[in-house]
């Protein structure tokens, strides 16, 4: 008789990452009988929701339902109908919503209420929407990349599953850059974590991890740009801001009210004699870098050493995976190769920022001008943050791996979040590996 396929014994999970600039929906899949194995969960779909982040819907909450429809319908298609009711859905909102909550807790609650109402209308097992903490965002990002890299597995492999894997059980640090915050998370080497707020203790698969993490609110790439503009306009002699972080010939009008809308610019707020100003790009990497450094207060440190703004940072240790906007920006700039030194990256950024705006627009005709115009700033910001903010050096730069996906799953906090909420990371090493599921009989 012919071999007959058995129904796959698999499970699914959905996580929505409600970031400051956009929302993405991720669908994960795993063999049901291997839930506690490391590395068995993988991403089968990513759906990017059209439109801005959910915090931008504060004055139009009635539009949230439509906004989420396409990606939720996509989830309905991808996941077999028979499994809809048992598929958990989690929504985690990050720094964009943390900032909205700082402005108005009531408005943030309203947005989340409407999100919850909308997501409850689907046939899945909706588990609620919440604003995750910066500490969680860092921790779950660290769990994700190390889970996908097989760092929690006790089995030693003779092969590498990814090109930059350092074939040992030393965990990777995690560097995450969003639009409104950035996270740094790693296991320091025999170092006391001097600040309790930055210390996490995990027991995963029978091993203890003492992890350092910090989330810098307002230091995501978009909010850092707003900060820089608010700082620089303070000393502008008129309503023209000659900005080294934009290409020569680039011009853009900015409303002062938009500049001061975010809590991130409050420290630079002042009464200006104009309602609008014009950014005029001059495209100078070095000057841009200097301007960005002024956002990092390094004059005060109550610990043995700090990153910036008085935040404890232990000495860097081991390899790091840099993902989210670290990866997207560096990928666009063609700087993600393992072989590109920090000096070469700096040189390429100098050349890129100096290119005239008209030339840039022609070279990258398919890229939205809003995004295209900010790559000079974003690339310079990434270098400034990693080198001066986190104290990477030309040597330790070689230990930074710009990662988009690991084995088909996006690097980011969502997988770690789901693994935790579905109790799929055991504290102890599972005693025995269950028999793998046979597809054919």
């Amino acid at each position: 008789t012919q071999n007959k396929a058995l129904p796959e014994n698999v499970k699914y999970g959905i996580v929505l990452d409600a970031g400051s600039s956009h929302t993405s929906l991720y669908i994960y899949k795993w063999p049901a009988e291997k839930e506690n194995d490391t590395g068995v969960v993988h991403q089968v779909e990513e759906c990017r929701v059209k439109g801005p982040g959910i915090s931008k819907f504060v004055q139009k909450v009635n539009e949230i339902g439509i906004y989420l429809t396409d990606c939720m319908e996509r989830a309905r298609e991808v996941i077999p109908r028979s499994q809809h009711q048992e598929t958990p859905v989690y929504l985690g909102a990050t720094a964009g919503m943390r900032l909205l909550r700082m402005e108005s807790e009531e408005l943030a609650d309203r947005v989340l209420d409407v999100v919850e109402t909308s997501l409850s209308n689907y046939p899945f097992d909706f588990q609620g929407a919440r604003i995750i903490t910066g500490q969680e965002e860092g921790a779950y990002g660290w769990i994700t990349i190390n889970y996908l890299l097989g760092k929690f597995s006790q089995k030693t492999r003779w092969f590498s599953i990814v090109p930059y894997e350092t074939n040992n059980q030393e965990t990777f640090g995690a560097l995450d850059l969003g639009g409104a915050s950035t996270q740094v998370t790693f296991v320091p080497q025999n170092q006391t974590i001097e600040s309790p707020d930055n210390a996490l203790q995990f027991r995963l698969y029978g091993k203890d991890y003492n992890v350092y993490t910090h989330s810098f609110l307002c230091y995501g790439k978009d909010q850092a740009l707003w900060q820089k503009l608010a700082k620089d306009i303070q000393v502008a002699s008129n309503e023209i801001l000659r900005d080294p972080c934009f290409h020569p010939g680039y011009k853009k009008v900015v409303n002062v009210s938009d500049l001061y809308k975010t809590p991130c610019t409050k420290r630079f707020e002042m009464t200006l004699p104009f309602q609008q100003f014009e950014i005029q790009g001059i495209g100078n990497y070095q000057q841009c870098h200097q301007s960005i450094l002024e956002l990092f207060n390094t004059s005060y440190c109550p610990y043995s050493q700090c990153a910036f703004n008085g935040i404890f940072l232990p000495p860097l240790q081991g390899d790091f995976g840099a993902f989210s906007a670290f990866y997207f920006v560096m990928k666009f700039l063609n700087l993600t190769s393992e072989k590109v030194s920090q000096e070469k990256v700096t040189e390429m950024m100098k050349k890129f920022c100096a290119q005239p705006w008209e030339e840039i627009k022609t070279s990258y005709a398919g890229v939205k001008e809003k995004y295209l115009s900010e790559y000079c700033f974003s690339g310079t910001y990434i270098l400034s943050l990693l080198l001066q903010g986190y104290h990477f050096t030309a040597d330790s730069w070689e230990h930074i791996h710009f990662i988009g996906k690991i084995q088909g799953s996006d690097a980011g906090w969502t997988l770690g979040y789901m693994l935790n909420l579905t109790n799929m990371i055991p504290a102890e090493q599972p005693l025995s590996t269950p028999l793998s599921h046979s597809t054919y009989v």
Epitope: L112, E116, T117, S120, A129, I131
Partner: antibody, heavy 121, light 107 residues
Framework: QVQLVQSGAEVKKPGASVKVSCKAS????????MHWVRQAPGQGLEWMGR????????WYAQKFQGRVTMTRDTSTSTVYMELSSLRSEDTAVYYC??????????????WGQGTLVTVSS | EIVLTQSPGTLSLSPGERATLSCRAS???????LAWYQQKPGQAPRLLIY???NRHTGIPDRFSGSGSGTDFTLTISRLEPEDFAVYYC????????FGGGTKVEIK
């Protein structure tokens, strides 16, 4: 819209227990903490404690520790407050009030209509 | 625990007048953790102000809150007939505590 509907008035004897319910609707039940506040006749407001409906964790005011138990039933979106060893000074209107989302601040946004508990021999 | 003392106990005013209610804490309270409630006879309290100065949804702009540290104030700029009620301040530090209340009555 958000509604908190409490159970009806109760008359109890000293030493007995009372269990007051508060049924929530119009929002995701697990997302907001629920608090209990009481008000003796002609007196001010007194906070008794709170419950996180998502995980069932509780936090009680010191005065009521050992005498109060707050529970929830997620299937019916209902929270309960049980007060034991009742005495005459427990005669009061008992209110449930919706608190914060995780990470928010502790103010009481929406209140139930109140349940009068009378303790009398 | 933090004790909140409200004064005056009773405030006798006419409609159209300005009411200023005080709430003093026994130790410093973060502004984000102070709220004001209004309660009318036979009704549940309702939230007016949170975070010391933020008006809750639907609360008229004649109600305003201010203050920091240990001294907080609720101001009703022009009393309307429906504003005559008891007002409570509330803080959160480790536990919630309420002030004793201020009754605003018609003169």
């Amino acid at each position: 819209q958000v509604q908190l509907v409490q159970s009806g008035a109760e008359v109890k004897k000293p030493g007995a227990s009372v269990k007051v319910s508060c049924k929530a609707s119009g929002y995701t039940f697990k997302s907001y903490e629920m608090h209990w506040v009481r008000q003796a006749p002609g007196q001010g407001l007194e906070w008794m404690g709170r419950i996180n409906p998502s995980v069932g964790s509780t936090w009680y005011a010191q005065k009521f520790q050992g005498r109060v138990t707050m529970t929830r039933d997620t299937s019916t979106s209902t929270v309960y407050m049980e007060l034991s060893s009742l005495r005459s000074e427990d005669t009061a209107v008992y209110y449930c009030a919706r608190g914060k989302r995780e990470g928010g601040t502790e103010y009481l946004r929406k209140w139930g209509q109140g349940t009068l508990v009378t303790v009398s021999s | 625990e933090i004790v909140l003392t409200q004064s005056p106990g009773t405030l006798s005013l006419s409609p159209g007048e300005r009411a200023t209610l005080s709430c003093r804490a026994s130790q410093s309270v973060a502004s984000s953790y102070l709220a004001w409630y209004q309660q009318k006879p036979g009704q549940a309290p309702r939230l007016l102000i949170y975070g010391a100065s933020n008006r809750h949804t639907g609360i008229p702009d004649r109600f305003s809150g201010s203050g920091s540290g240990t001294d907080f104030t609720l101001t009703i700029s022009r009393l309307e007939p429906e504003d005559f009620a008891v007002y409570y301040c509330q803080q959160y530090h480790n536990a919630i505590t309420f002030g004793g209340g201020t009754k605003v009555e018609i003169k």
